[in-house]
């Protein structure tokens, strides 16, 4: 390399993944500027494990590793990590060749290239590199799915992560499928979890300065099948006044396909109950969950007649659920006059209507 | 074994309906989740929507927003797409897709995944 | 809606070959990418998730890498029945988009 030469990666984009792990060797007294992802969104700069400023003689700035003046402490391993995460753009090793001025040829080229023969930089317990998303302990997810536990960390030296379930070590061993590790993401992923997967999960992370931990709590959600689940509070009681417009709603929650029926209670021969103690009912809809507008009731221009209780009947595969309101209906002269009408009634009951 | 067969399709006239079935067999979808996607001839793939069976939410394209409705009957393991108001530019094969959810805990939300395909089932739009 | 770029959009190689197709997306979708390989009149077929991990049953020689709005998928060593079209997808925003596709052909 000649004297004026800067080492320079260039195009500054983020690198192919031919251009990982290079090795340069640089002139003592020489200026680097190594390039790492688009310059609003560069990477950030690491040496040893440990983050650059980006202010000094050695700087991590706009995705660019500039060295002033390269000195002999400048060899060693340099690592560029993308933005929000810890994967590797550029894993590159700094190793000095003949000095600009003056060289120690006793001098083991190779020390510059092993941390362990290193004391120049400062070391550092691991840390979170993002603890605000470590705070969200207990996690529910349904069975079938796949989980992905991540804890990124730094130090220096780089720290080595290992996982715990319910304070044991975890290698995923004795579990179907077993368990998928990504140590340069940090991250454990279970795939198709069951409820034997519920429990603690422990990412300890750790380095020769120190060690941190943190807990995630799973929970394995599994799904019992159930008949329609009505939403409480609907249909609702109303009071219309003779000639307008009526509106019952009714909000259906069902995996197996529903079938909805709206129901009006009917008086036969002065009795509102059969002798099987049924109620007298008279279908006004009928349809599938999926027709439009099967959840709503509409009653147009209602009458005197139309007054009395209503009730949304849902039934799946499983079993039948049904709630029921009342309709008041007012004459047009007194439309100030409010029926205490009886609450809607919440049922849980099979119903049988003829 | 995971199987998906589409049904449904066909020619249809500009602005009719048409609905399609996804038959599904060596799973349940009880908290997993049903996609549908389609391909225009000689096109690359379109997410069209999804049915996530754990909560019955379904999520749509904005190009098939208010016209596409998906829906599913658990206890015979079949999701539907419901098609009405169709246009020329919904011509294409029309896959169902098993789809299940990895749960980044860290950054708490879900990744959609689609493992399992059918055939598919071409729809033409014409008159 | 997050754009999906592929680059290149079709490829000639040859078995044995090494092949890279990037995926770039218009912005940050952290992990969130897989990978799908489809064979004319075929549907399509998962290949990898989350960016980097393979799918049960997909063969070795296919791998995935990136993170934000950069990613890869490479085959290590293209076999005869690789020659396909591969779809990448991300779905961290809402909608799911897909790139528009890179063609692998034989040269």
């Known amino acids: 390399l000649e004297a004026s030469e800067e080492v320079e990666l260039e195009p500054c984009l983020a690198p192919s993944l031919e251009q990982q792990e290079q090795e340069l060797t640089v002139a003592l007294g020489q200026p680097v500027r190594l390039c790492c992802g688009r310059a609003e969104r560069g990477g950030h700069w690491y040496k040893e494990g440990s983050r650059l400023a980006p202010a000094g003689r050695v700087r991590g700035w706009r995705g660019r590793l500039e060295i002033a003046s390269f000195l002999p402490e400048d060899a060693g391993r340099y690592l560029c990590l993308a933005r929000g995460s810890m994967i590797v753009l550029q894993n590159l090793t700094l190793i000095t060749g003949d000095s600009l001025t003056s060289s120690n040829d006793d001098e083991d080229p190779k020390s510059h290239r092993d941390p362990s023969n290193r004391h120049s930089y400062p070391q550092q317990a691991p840390y979170w590199t993002h603890p605000q998303r470590m705070e969200k302990k207990l996690h529910a997810v349904p069975a079938g799915n796949t989980v992905k536990f991540r804890c990124p960390a730094a130090g220096n030296p780089t720290p080595t992560i290992r996982w715990l379930k319910d304070g044991q070590a975890f290698h995923g061993e004795n579990r179907i499928g077993g368990i998928r590790l990504r140590h340069q993401h940090w991250s454990l992923v279970m795939e198709s979890v069951v409820p034997s997967d519920r429990g603690t999960y422990t990412c300890l992370v750790e380095n020769a300065v120190g060690s941190i931990r943190y807990n995630y709590l799973l929970d394995v959600l599994e799904r019992s099948p159930h008949r329609p689940i009505l939403q409480a509070g609907l249909p609702a009681n109303t009071t219309a006044v003779v000639g307008s417009d009526v509106e019952l709603l009714c909000k259906v929650y069902s995996d197996a396909q529903p079938h909805i029926q709206w129901l009006k209670h009917i008086v036969i021969n002065g009795s509102s109950f059969g002798a099987d103690g049924f109620p007298y009912v008279q279908v006004l809809k009928t349809a599938d969950i999926n027709s439009s507008e099967v959840e709503v009731l509409y009653l147009r221009n209602v009458s005197a007649e139309d007054a009395g209780e209503y009730t949304c009947l849902a039934g799946n595969s499983i079993g039948l659920s049904y709630q029921s309101a009342w309709l008041t209906v007012l004459p047009e002269e007194d439309p100030t006059w409010t029926a205490a009408a009886p609450e809607a009634r919440y049922t849980d009951h099979h119903h049988h209507h003829h | 074994e995971v199987q998906l067969v589409e049904s449904g399709g066909g020619l249809v006239q500009p602005g009719g309906s048409l609905r399609l079935s996804c038959a599904a067999s060596g799973f349940t979808f009880t908290s997993t989740g049903i996609s549908w996607v389609r391909q225009a001839p000689g096109k690359g793939l379109e997410w069209v929507g999804r049915y996530w069976a754990w909560d019955g939410s379904t999520n749509y394209a904005d190009s098939v927003k208010g016209r596409f409705t998906i829906s599913a009957d658990t206890s015979k393991n079949t999701a539907y797409l419901q098609m009405n108001s169709l246009r020329a530019e919904d011509t294409a094969v029309y896959y169902c897709?098993?789809?299940?959810?990895?749960?980044?805990?860290?950054?708490?939300?879900?990744?959609?995944?689609?493992?399992?395909w059918g055939q598919g089932t071409l729809v033409t739009v014409s008159s | 809606d997050i754009q999906m770029t592929q680059s290149p959009s079709s490829l000639s190689a040859s078995v044995g070959d090494r092949v890279t197709i990037t995926c770039r997306a218009s912005q940050d979708v952290d992990t969130s990418l897989a990978w799908y390989k489809q064979k004319p009149g075929k549907a399509p077929k998962l290949l990898i998730y989350s960016a980097s991990f393979l799918y049960s049953g997909v063969p070795s020689r296919f791998s995935g890498s990136g993170s934000g709005t950069d990613f890869t998928l490479t085959i290590s060593s293209l076999q005869p029945e690789d020659f396909a079209t591969y779809y990448c997808?991300?779905?961290?925003?809402?909608?799911?988009?897909f790139g528009q596709g890179t063609k692998v052909e034989i040269k």
């Open positions: 997808q991300q779905s961290t925003g809402h909608p799911q988009t």
């Open positions: 897709a098993r789809t299940y959810g990895i749960y980044d805990l860290y950054v708490d939300y879900t990744e959609y995944v689609m493992d399992y």
